[in-house]
């Protein structure tokens, strides 16, 4: 292999990999022929000047995980075939003014997980075929303007994990190539006016986990393209009436973990390709008439955990496609018999740990083939006749936690109960709250004075298994959580849905075993 | 390019437990929904259920309720199917996907695990 | 759960010429808007891969000879013109609620 050094493993692809603690200098003599070299973890704490000058066929050079805190200007000098160079955790602090220089061909730059305070426009002027640049997980607290303005082919940028405080409108003016920005767990607290106004081929855009409080009314307005946007984990409070208004291409929003108190009519939209909406612990207290009508296509719609006291009859006008719908974790005391009245395609909705006392008769008239209803942990005493009668693919119904009062007008509704005791599950069945001589009997076998008939239980078709989620195990599971995830107590103990980056959503969703997609 | 690359095969006696993984690479992996798929010898395709890592969150089938276990580690961008109590019907094929959205099709499969159960 | 019946089993069809394939579903898998139903191609010693979505939208990278349609219960997928590299099973499968898979059809050269 023309000379392949000991603490290294050369392959006939003309391959070297070098790896061990071992290592504090890069090894020689590298084969000539090499065209990817690869140091890992090792203890090379500097690169010196043209350790890699007999290599010059390197196409991709990666240098990860090791102690690298020094390099020289010249490092990769003679290197002008390299297309990728990895310099990704490192303890680099400070890049030398022209260490790129004379790598014409390099396309993929990752310098990220490092502790570097700062970049300069001279340090990527000479870098005009770069299209991608991770930057994440080092301490820069701000890009001076210029510092991209060479990097007109540039596809990709990653800037997350970052001490950004602001941004410069200017700083991407030149990237109209880009398709990838993200500028996610940073420090940004507002977004000037104009900053994405360049960025025309933009298909993703990750804000999540700042701290901006505002968005400009046209901040996303030239992003036509834009398919994935992430506003989640922030602090904003109002979203301006055309903010999402020239996003055609969206099939990706994030709004959670915000401080969104209303959504006006319309404000979604149109977005023909949205998909699923996650707009869980927020402030939300009411939702108006067609404020989510754009959203045709919409098939999972996330409510929880905000504080919606009031749903207009209208709210969910135009979700015609809307498979799953979770609003539990909310103030809701009434619901009008029409709410629910266009969501023809449902399946399962969400409703427990809200505060309702009743439910309209009709509340589930258009909604033939509804699966799963979550209705436990509410302050009904009794519901309606026959208000599931027509629910013939409901398979788990949850009424548990209720202060259901067992007198003779429970009659109907104990009846069916045990007509379809299966749909009630296993784990926890509704008890009587009063009178207080049959306080916390089951609902289901109490004796109301009344002959009952005995009954033949229908099995019940099994169903399908879990909307969203009981089947997680409980957090913190460092198995499946990143190392940054930050997670906040559960909202309530019956805990269904847990997420990763920033919020513990295990009770997001609070809907169980029916329907999967 | 996008990858889904699965470990290698497994061969385990009856009643024992093996764990498949699911290396992605080439997306963002927090931002798709991995289902994971069974192909027994000779047979067709039977889903298992599908995980969110975003959120952590499962669904199962119900048949496979209790026999499969779902999990990911997104640091290592990869997911992970355990198989219990295993039988001899457990043995085949098995496959994870990637789905855009819960409700899209999978557009991108591992090259799949083969896991023998015998005596 | 809701059943998909392929047809045929198993087809052979000259080279040029057009394949059919039906699926027929137990209960509808479509809303006015979509239609749940998937279809993919798997080779022998390969994993399955997706050629149609929701009923009729041709997966990027998928040669246009194939198209699929139908709503409600009943599906084709239709290969125009038969490859050689076309041979393989081909499978359709719902996501309206619990996934299931049809049995296949083995397309094979005559």
């Known amino acids: 292999y023309h000379g392949c050094p000991s603490e290294c493993t050369c392959s006939r692809a003309s391959q070297v990999e070098c790896t061990g603690a071992r290592i504090v200098a890069v090894p020689t003599p590298l084969p000539w022929n090499a065209m990817s070299l690869q140091i890992l973890n090792t203890h090379i704490t500097e690169l010196n000047e043209s350790p890699f000058l007999n290599i010059s066929a390197l196409i991709a050079l990666r240098i990860e995980k090791n102690e690298l805190s020094r390099i020289t200007p010249g490092a990769f000098r003679n290197l002008g075939s390299l297309r990728y160079l990895s310099l990704a955790n490192n303890k680099l602090q400070v890049l030398p003014i022209g260490l790129f220089q004379g790598l014409d061909s390099l396309e993929s730059l990752l310098l990220s997980s490092n502790q570097l305070l700062q970049i300069q426009p001279a340090h990527f002027s000479q870098c005009s075929n770069l299209k991608e640049l991770q930057l994440h997980g080092n301490h820069l607290e701000y890009i001076p303007d210029g510092a991209f303005d060479h990097l007109v082919g540039l596809t990709k940028l990653n800037l997350g994990k970052n001490s950004l405080t602001h941004i410069s409108p200017r700083v991407f003016q030149h990237l109209g190539n880009l398709q990838v920005l993200r500028l996610y767990e940073n420090r940004l607290t507002d977004i000037p006016m104009g900053t994405f106004d360049g960025l025309v081929n933009l298909q993703e855009l990750a804000l999540q986990q700042n701290q901006i409080g505002l968005l400009s009314p046209g901040l996303f307005h030239n992003n036509h393209n834009l398919q994935r946007l992430y506003l989640s984990n922030n602090h904003i409070s109002q979203l301006p009436p055309s903010v999402f208004m020239q996003l055609p291409q969206l099939n990706r929003l994030t709004l959670f973990g915000n401080s969104l108190k209303e959504l006006s009519p319309g404000i979604f939209g149109p977005m023909p390709n949205l998909r699923e909406l996650w707009l869980y612990d927020n402030h939300i207290s009411s939702l108006p008439d067609n404020v989510f009508s754009n959203l045709r296509q919409l098939q999972v719609l996330i409510l929880s955990r905000n504080q919606i006291s009031f749903i207009s009859p209208g709210a969910f006008n135009g979700l015609t496609e809307l498979r799953e719908l979770s609003l539990h974790t909310n103030a809701l005391q009434d619901l009008d018999g029409n709410v629910f009245r266009m969501l023809a395609n449902l399946q399962n909705i969400s409703l427990q740990n809200n505060r309702l006392r009743q439910l309209p008769g009709n509340i589930f008239a258009n909604v033939n083939g509804l699966m799963a209803i979550q209705l436990q942990n509410n302050q009904l005493e009794n519901l309606p006749l026959g208000i599931f009668d027509h629910l013939g693919k409901l398979c788990e119904l949850r009424l548990y936690d209720n202060p259901w009062r067992c007198d003779s007008d429970i009659l109907p509704l104990r009846n069916w109960l045990l007509l379809n005791q299966p749909r009630l599950g296993t784990d926890t069945v509704p008890v009587c709250f009063s009178p207080a001589n049959v306080r916390g009997q089951s609902l289901i076998i109490i004796n109301v004075n009344v002959a009952v008939p005995s009954v033949h239980v229908p099995e019940v078709p099994s169903y399908p298994e879990t909307p969203w989620y009981p089947d997680t195990p409980s957090y913190p599971d460092t198995t499946s959580v990143s190392s940054t995830t930050e997670l906040t107590s559960p909202v309530e103990d019956y805990t269904d849905l847990t997420t990763i980056q920033v919020t513990d959503d295990r009770s997001v969703w609070g809907m169980t075993q029916a329907q999967s997609g | 390019e996008v990858q889904l690359v699965q470990s290698g095969a497994e061969v385990k006696k009856p009643g024992s437990s093996v764990k498949v993984s699911c290396k992605a690479s080439g997306f963002t992996f927090t931002d798709y929904y991995i289902h994971w798929v069974k192909q027994a010898p000779g047979q067709g395709l039977e889903w298992i259920g599908l995980?969110?890592?975003?959120?952590?969150?499962?669904n199962y089938n119900q048949k496979f309720k209790g026999k499969a276990t779902l999990t990911v580690d997104t640091s290592t961008t990869t997911a992970y199917m355990e198989m219990s109590s295993l039988r001899s019907e457990d043995t085949a094929v098995y496959y994870c996907a990637r789905g855009d959205n819960k409700y899209d099709a999978m557009d991108y499969w591992g090259q799949g695990t083969t896991v023998t159960v015998s005596s | 759960d809701i059943v998909l019946t392929q047809s045929p089993d198993s087809l052979a069809v000259s080279l040029g010429e057009r394949a059919t394939i039906n699926c027929r579903a137990s209960?509808?898998?479509?809303?006015?808007?979509?239609?749940?139903m998937h279809w993919y191609q798997q080779k022998p010693g390969q994993p399955p891969k997706l050629l149609i979505k929701y009923a009729s939208s041709l997966e990027s990278g998928v040669p246009d000879r194939f198209s699929g349609s139908g709503s409600g219960t009943d599906f084709t997928l239709t290969i125009s013109s038969l490859q050689a590299e076309d041979v393989a099973v081909y499978y359709c499968e719902h996501s309206w609620e619990i996934r299931t898979f049809g049995g296949g059809t083995k397309v094979e050269i005559k």
């Open positions: 995980v969110y890592p975003y959120i952590g969150g499962t």
């Open positions: 209960q509808s898998v479509s809303t006015s808007s979509y239609s749940y």
